[in-house]
């Protein structure tokens, strides 16, 4: 029985990608009045550009060139975090520190956190039914390609201190294969950036480990300190009291250690 | 505890000014959006408007633009609602309400007061 | 301005019954919507936000679903304090406008 459409080993397009994509569109430009001259029709269009009727294990990073430009964001390059593999506190984090912005932060990051989404070669439908696999299938998918491209140019524009939360639960704290570990540790640029300080965060309450201490980390400070940029790194040892703090740091409680 | 008190209401004849405030205790008032939203006698709730934590941002619905006015002072943990050339169809309870802190308001409203009475009536 | 319309706009049901009330958005809002709670001569009260999350301290018995145009507020086994009338909002664009509300009602 011949296979009229490909099947692909990861999950199709989330439902309702096109109205999902405008209405967050809409809501960013609304709630960040410096994005208010973005057309968010133009951005659906563009985004739509890039991966509709191509082959989704045929993606670049030129595909998304006109996303991109439409896209365009200046953030606070010295307020930049970065994260691995604990998203949920690093977001929890930047809504109450508002001066602070992960990638989901920007209008891009945040059009794309958490959907999913591919086309069909020569066809100008999108595939709700699978969509690649990056390592069953191929790494030039259109999720992963679009990470890349936004990771990539989000290290870029960073400067001074750039902070990244790392997930102290995990085998490897630092992961060389995460997108921090092979994107953003690579386009971080020396002559901008002067430290990158790691927050190690711990999952066990009683866990009093200097996970700084961690062989990974220790590889995160070689690479780091490779490239010319000087590395710091801090525990963060009651994750659930660093974000209560960060809330009211005139709580009495939040001069000792967290 | 987190509370809000609204106070200002009353008796106006149409045309004329109010100012309603909110006063909140029990948190950091300035790091919270915060709302207006009415009840008309009877029927459902209207939004009113927003103000951003810091007062950079500020929407209002269609029905009160060019009319009235959200501000804040974060040194009086106090809201305020400046209403001007008032018509009968503003009669409502006037409620004052909180965003939980997110940072794109998109988490609903978590903290009401109890609401303070406008009356336009000639 | 984004248009909701709740259905039923009133619903008469007993205490156990399992109800669910119906939120329309007139065009697509993701996940951006907001359940809410009110009684006679009250402020309301937030059940749900972000289509399906429990506001901290509300009973498990309301749950939310739905995104894009079509939403759900299901109470699973209705207690005789539930009886009230609900509300939706939506939080896409500014204004957040509401839903004209459902009566739930002892039958």
């Known amino acids: 029985v011949p296979r009229w459409r490909q099947q692909w080993s990861g999950p199709g397009t989330t439902k309702r990608f096109p109205e999902t994509v405008l209405a967050r569109c809409v809501k960013y430009t609304e709630i960040h009045p410096e994005m208010r001259h973005v057309d968010c029709q133009s951005v659906w269009d563009a985004f739509k550009g890039a991966f509709i009727s191509k082959h989704p294990c045929n993606i670049t990073e030129e595909d998304y060139q006109p996303l991109m430009k439409l896209g365009t964001q200046t953030v606070p390059c010295n307020k930049i975090l970065l994260w691995s593999r604990i998203k949920d506190l690093a977001h929890q984090f930047t809504q109450v520190q508002r001066d602070m912005f992960t990638l989901e932060d920007t209008l891009l990051g945040y059009l794309a956190d958490d959907l999913t989404w591919c086309g069909e070669f020569n066809t100008s439908k999108i595939n709700y039914q699978s969509c690649p696999d990056w390592r069953k299938d191929c790494s030039n998918n259109p999720v992963s390609v679009f990470w890349k491209t936004v990771s990539r140019r989000f290290a870029e524009a960073a400067c001074d201190v750039v902070h990244v939360m790392l997930n102290g639960s995990r085998s490897k704290i630092f992961d060389k294969n995460s997108t921090f570990g092979s994107v953003e540790v690579h386009n971080l640029q020396p002559e901008k950036v002067q430290t990158l300080e790691a927050w190690v965060i711990h999952g066990g309450r009683e866990d009093s480990r200097d996970l700084c201490q961690d062989p990974t980390i220790k590889e995160l400070e070689s690479i780091i300190s490779k490239r010319n940029i000087q590395f710091s790194c801090k525990n963060i040892y009651r994750p659930d009291k660093f974000l209560q703090c960060v809330k009211n740091p005139e709580d009495s409680s939040c001069t000792s250690e967290i | 505890q987190v509370q809000l008190v609204e106070s200002g209401g009353g008796v106006v004849q149409p045309g004329r000014s109010l100012r309603l405030s909110c006063a909140a205790s029990?948190?950091?008032?300035?790091?919270?959006?915060m709302y207006w939203v009415r009840q008309a006698p009877g029927k459902g709730l209207e939004w009113v408007a927003v103000i951003w934590y810091d007062g950079s941002n500020k929407y209002y619905a269609d029905s009160v633009k060019g009319r009235f006015t959200i501000s804040r002072d974060n040194s009086k943990n106090t809201l305020y609602l400046q209403m001007n050339s008032l018509r009968a169809e503003d009669t409502a309870v006037y409620h004052c309400a909180r965003d939980p802190g997110l940072r794109y308001f998109d988490g609903g409203m978590d903290v009401w007061g109890q609401g303070t009475t406008v009356t336009v009536s000639s | 301005d984004i248009q909701l319309t709740q259905s039923p706009s009133f619903l008469s049901a007993s205490v156990g019954d399992r109800v669910t009330i119906t939120c329309r958005a007139s065009?697509?809002?993701?996940?951006?919507l907001a359940w809410y709670q009110q009684k006679p001569g009250k402020a309301p009260k937030l059940l749900i936000f972000a289509a399906s999350t429990l506001h901290s301290g509300v009973p498990s018995r309301f749950s939310g679903s739905g995104s894009g145009t079509e939403f759900t507020l299901t109470i699973s086994s209705l207690q005789p304090e539930d009886f009230a009338t609900y509300y939706c909002?939506?939080?896409?664009?500014?204004?957040?406008?509401f839903g004209q509300g459902t009566k739930l009602e002892i039958k």
């Open positions: 909002q939506q939080l896409n664009s500014f204004p957040y406008t």
């Open positions: 065009q697509g809002i993701s996940s951006y």
């Open positions: 029990g948190f950091t008032f300035s790091s919270y959006g």
